[in-house]
Amino acid sequence: EDELQVIQPEKSVSVAAGESATLRCAMTSLIPVGPIMWFRGAGAGRELIYNQKEGHFPRVTTVSELTKRNNLDFSISISNITPADAGTYYCVKFRKGSPDDVEFKSGAGTELSVRAKPS
């Protein structure tokens, strides 16, 4: 069985301020089981944008229905983009662990740039 891969097909996305940004991510397998998370930035200071498991992320919606048992699409849409949202976004697969889930594999990242709102 091939090992799971995290695919972020776009290296960069450009969005006008005030619009929504869609960041695409797909898995090649459901195994190992564990949640998907999205982060802005890398390393210790990265910012959690979305956690499949828990939390309230009012600006984030998932493109696909994550409650489907066979879902492999973990793309998200972030509403009302501002210049402060610019950065590189990573889709990260965790495998289950105790007490904490363990980072398993990350996508290559998608750089979000924000254009000035058209006048």
Epitope: L30, I31, P32, V33, K53, E65, L66, T67, K68, R69
Partner: antibody, heavy 118, light 107 residues
Framework: DLQLVESGGGVVRPGESLRLSCAAS????????MSWVRQAPGKGLEWLAG????????YYIDSVKGRFTISRDNSKNSLYLQMNSLTAEDTAVYYC???????????WGLGTLVTVSS | ALTQPASVSANPGETVKIICSGG??????YGWYQQKSPGSAPVTVI????KRPSDIPSRFSGSASGSAATLTITGVRVEDEAVYFC???????????FGAGTTLTVL
């Protein structure tokens, strides 16, 4: 308070049909996958079917595939189980259950009893 | 199939462990469900291997390792007497399964 209330159980003859309902309240029903689980007298729990939050995807245990149909109406906060060609082996208490993000169960209804007898 | 002992017993205050085996660690999540009488509504005491719902006492804990999951009740009480079912979700088959149940008797 979160509540799941099943209804529609009763006594039917072999070969007949029954439709169970589960009324949900106290949470955003349309955001959660749901399942039906049953328990035959003196037996353990048996998962029967699950349905995604939007209702587009359904999943069944082999023994009920083709006979039972799970569905939902998010506008009515309701889950359903249509059961056809019932046999004595379908006699059980039927529970609806809310699924967690990873398809386990966090909340259960009180159950409704289905008796199939001639 | 999930395998768990048919019965366990303990004195009040003791620690009880119920082991459920039969799943593959990398494709399976486990839960534990308490049923105080036949036909009564099950109550989830553990989901996602080790997550305890907020209304469940802290004496209940769960863990998973290899092909087994364990429910631990630390300082068991008389009101914990019940049948405990382990359950599993398999990400390969999309199917939920349950063990046959373990009857806990508090002496």
């Amino acid at each position: 308070d979160l509540q799941l209330v099943e209804s529609g159980g009763g006594v039917v003859r072999p070969g007949e049909s029954l439709r169970l309902s589960c009324a949900a309240s106290g949470f955003t029903f349309s955001s959660y996958a749901m399942s039906w689980v049953r328990q035959a007298p003196g037996k353990g729990l048996e998962w029967l079917a699950g349905i995604s939050a939007g209702g587009s995807d359904t999943y069944y245990i082999d023994s009920v595939k083709g006979r039972f149909t799970i569905s939902r109406d998010n506008s009515k906060n309701s889950l359903y189980l249509q059961m056809n060609s019932l046999t004595a082996e379908d006699t059980a208490v039927y529970y609806c259950a809310r699924e967690t993000w990873n398809h386990l169960f966090d909340y259960w209804g009180l159950g409704t009893l289905v008796t199939v007898s001639s | 199939a999930l395998t768990q002992p048919a019965s366990v017993s303990a004195n009040p205050g003791e620690t009880v462990k119920i082991i459920c085996s039969g799943g593959d660690y990398y494709s399976t999540y486990y839960g534990w469900y308490q049923q105080k009488s036949p036909g009564s509504a099950p109550v989830t005491v553990i989901h996602s291997d080790d997550k305890r719902p907020s209304d469940i006492p802290s004496r209940f804990s769960g863990s998973a390792s290899g092909s087994a999951a364990t429910l631990t009740i630390t300082g068991v009480r008389v009101e914990d007497e019940a049948v405990y079912f382990c359950g599993a979700y398999d990400g390969r088959t999309y199917i939920n399964t349950f063990g046959a149940g373990t009857t806990l008797t508090v002496l």
